[in-house]
Interface confidence: low
């Protein structure tokens, strides 16, 4: 017995984080010779029977979850993983700082603090140069970032966003960039650690204190690395899980 039609991939170009009024293209990619594509916005009646959706100017109403599938003959493929399209610049930018400072010795520890004047309960941190994150919504509820040994791979420019779990696809503008400098090392690891983090991070309602920890576990499709945080849930042994399903993840 041959298997089902394989699921297509769905990606946002140039990024799934889209500033308001900026363009983005959603592209559904299946095998050659597809008869029909269907690209839809979940939790709405919007869909189109085309592989590419060009959005010339991002709007709040267009943020959300998207999924696609394709048809060959009478058969429909399995659905793509969900893509979550985020509108940024909806709220004022938070501030990003490093504790004890933005210069850290190799092997030392550093904590990045993302702070907002709003009562937001969610924060996202990402490193410049990585592809924009393709996130899984459950991760808005994961505040699990262990202290790790900093390496040269952690050097770079960081920004953070803040937003509310009530509107997880509407983010603030990015913070001003923070340059993290790792001193006393000359070797850059060829790859990052892959062990998932354990739940240790805690912070107050409007302040996210994140120990820098990049693993392939945090929301990623290719080589992107991004981390998010939210208040710790002590009754959840595995760390908080998202309250609704939207895979696009």
């Amino acid at each position: 017995q041959s298997g089902p039609l394989p699921k297509p991939s769905l990606q946002a170009l140039p990024s799934s984080l889209v500033p308001l009024e900026k363009p983005v293209t959603l592209r559904c990619q299946g095998p050659p010779g597809v008869d029909l594509y269907r690209l839809e916005k979940l939790s709405s009646s919007r869909y189109q029977d085309q592989a590419v959706l060009f959005i010339p100017a991002m709007k709040r109403s267009l943020a959300g979850r998207y999924r696609c599938s394709y048809q060959n003959g009478s058969l429909w493929s399995l659905p793509s993983d969900q893509l979550e399209l985020v509108a940024t610049g909806v709220f004022a930018k938070p501030s990003l700082s490093a504790q004890p400072g933005p210069a850290v010795s190799s092997g030392g520890d550093v904590t990045l603090q993302c702070q907002t004047r709003y009562g937001f309960d969610q924060f996202a941190l990402y490193k410049e140069g990585d592809p924009a994150p393709y996130k899984n919504p459950e991760r808005w509820y994961r505040a699990s970032f262990p202290i790790i040994t900093v390496t040269a791979a952690h050097s770079g420019t960081y920004r953070c966003y803040s937003f509310s779990s009530r509107d997880p696809y509407l983010w603030s503008a990015p913070s001003d960039p923070l340059e993290l400098v790792v001193t006393g090392t000359s070797v850059t690891p060829s790859r990052l650690p892959t062990e998932p983090p354990s739940p240790v991070a805690e912070f107050s309602e409007a302040t996210a204190e994140l120990t820098v920890s990049f693993t392939n576990e945090v929301f990623t499709t290719e080589t992107s690395r991004s981390i998010t945080a939210s208040p710790k849930e002590s009754d959840s042994p595995a760390g908080p899980a998202r309250q609704y399903y939207t895979k696009g993840n």
């Epitope: 429909w76 399995l78 993983d81 899984n136 899980a241 399903y245 993840n249």
Partner: antibody, heavy 114, light 106 residues
């Protein structure tokens, strides 16, 4: 050929933890997700949770406080851990591939009893 | 969470006959429904996904239809090997099974 095989302890004492391993072959865990489903005696199927190809997880809301799903891509294994077991957790536990669960294991029977 | 109400919970039919099972979702699931056959001692088998797409190797006497909140699954030309319990599954938002329908042959 796609295959999934569950392995578990068989018997677990109340209030203890349950750990089950799903070993897969014929597909990559970096691309496909794996679900966990159970069936209590003489009852229907119940979805427990899922781990996606990129490592993210989804859990049934009533179980998420005591459920954890993880995986080891290099060993082609997915792990289910459930804490604070009661006799209501007695069931046959299945792992199944991705959405909408096109391939299933045969299941492993778990009895919660003292 | 989305609830799936499956009916009937059991039914009996004759060889060569036709049976229909229905599932009603508590909200619009946008055709993201699958149907499974489950026999004792085995893992469930996926028959249909996305409302009406038959899995490769599944006989065409199995069919599915529906939209919005209401979906149905039918077996025509019933065969003795069709004795099993059948489940619907929504996968639009989390995953939820229907309660199951036990099919017996008269």
């Amino acid at each position: 050929q796609v295959q999934l095989q569950e392995s578990g302890p068989g018997l677990v004492a109340p209030s203890q933890s349950l750990s089950i391993t799903c070993t897969v072959s014929g597909f990559s865990l970096t691309y496909y997700g794996v679900n966990w489903v159970r069936q209590p005696p003489s009852r229907g199927l119940e979805w427990l949770g899922m781990i996606w190809g990129d490592g993210s997880t989804d859990y049934q809301s009533t179980l998420k406080s005591r459920l954890s799903i993880s995986k080891d891509n290099s060993k082609s294994q997915v792990f289910l851990k459930m804490n604070s077991l009661t006799t209501d957790d007695t069931a046959r536990y299945y792992c199944a591939r991705d959405l909408p669960m096109d391939y299933w294991g045969q299941g492993t029977s778990v009895t919660v009893s003292s | 969470d989305i609830q799936m109400t499956q009916s009937p919970s059991s039914l009996s039919a004759s060889v060569g006959g036709r049976v229909t099972i229905t599932c009603k979702a508590s909200q619009d699931i946008n055709k993201y429904i699958a149907w499974y056959q489950h026999k004792p001692g085995k893992g469930p088998s996926l028959l249909i996904h996305y409302t009406s797409t038959l899995q490769p190797g599944v006989p065409s006497r199995f069919s599915g239809s529906g939209s919005g909140r209401d979906y149905s699954f039918s077996i025509s030309n019933l065969q003795p090997e069709d004795i099993a319990t059948y489940y619907c599954l929504q996968y639009a938002n989390l995953l939820t099974f229907g309660g199951g329908t036990k099919l017996e042959i008269k």
